[in-house]
Interface confidence: low
């Protein structure tokens, strides 16, 4: 349905800072299809760590941490002229203020590791 | 904003023990580390653990002899040094981090503590 002429749009000055928000995720099965496993298969393979905090929401997230400074090659040996290094993805979460408890949060930005690509290295010459 | 203050440290002989602390106002449930800087050297990563404490991860050089924990009631870190080498000597420090990639990276930790000295001699 079109927006009500009302309603500032969201990136409108006018918008409210404060605003409440339904914590039931609409399509939250979207992505339930079974894990990929390139986590394993990568040249630049990473492991998944939990990273927990009691005072945000979503209090659990998952992010990746690379299992070697070096790629791995086809033999399965790993490469050090060349360098596993994250993909990192800024999100957003809210952090609960004041702490502890109470139903208000405030949107904080966030960095997360969602994955592990293998790059070139900088190669710094020396004059 | 988050303040580290470190303490624990001192003069041992090599092959001693030392127990590190690092009290944590603020918010603590990031991943936290302990990081060392020796005379003359750039700082060093040393030990990281989860914002649950589920997960450590620790230098090549300390593995075996170096354990880091955390108390998340207390706010605080703890780094249990063993068998203490003479090229452990540094000032220790602690710091937030806010996820476990690149732990090895001291550029990646964002509240640092002013450290304590650690000197290992006979």
């Known amino acids: 349905s079109p927006q009500n002429p009302g309603c500032p749009n969201a990136e409108d000055k006018n918008f409210p800072r404060t605003v409440m928000v339904n914590l039931n995720i609409r399509n939250r099965n979207t992505n339930s299809k079974r894990a990929s496993d390139y986590y394993n298969r990568s040249s630049s393979p990473w492991n998944l760590h939990r990273n927990e905090d009691p005072e945000r929401y979503p209090s659990v997230i998952w992010e990746a941490k690379c299992r070697h400074l070096g790629c791995v090659d086809a033999d399965g040996n790993v490469d050090y002229h060349m360098n596993s290094v994250p993909i990192q993805q800024e999100i957003l979460v809210l952090r609960r203020e004041p702490r502890h408890c109470t139903n208000s949060f405030r949107l904080e930005k966030m960095l997360v590791s969602v994955g592990c690509t293998c790059v070139t290295p900088i190669v710094r010459h020396v004059a | 904003e988050v303040q580290l203050v470190e303490s624990g440290g001192g003069l041992v002989q090599p092959g001693g023990s030392l127990r590190l602390s690092c009290a944590a106002s603020?918010?603590?449930?990031?991943?936290m580390g302990w990081l060392r800087q020796a005379p003359g050297k750039e700082r060093e990563f040393v030990a990281a653990?989860?914002?649950?404490?589920?997960?450590?991860y620790y230098a090549d050089s300390v593995k075996g002899r170096f354990t880091i924990s955390r108390d998340n009631s207390k706010n605080t870190l703890y780094l249990q040094m063993n068998s203490l080498r003479p090229e452990d000597t540094a000032v220790y420090y602690c710091?937030?981090?806010?996820?476990?990639?690149?732990?090895?990276?001291?550029?990646?930790?964002?509240?640092w503590g002013q450290g304590t000295l650690v000197t290992v001699s006979s």
């Open positions: 710091a937030t981090r806010r996820g476990l990639y690149y732990v090895w990276d001291a550029n990646d930790y964002e509240n």
């Open positions: 653990i989860s914002g649950s404490g589920d997960d450590t």
């Open positions: 603020g918010r603590t449930y990031d991943a």
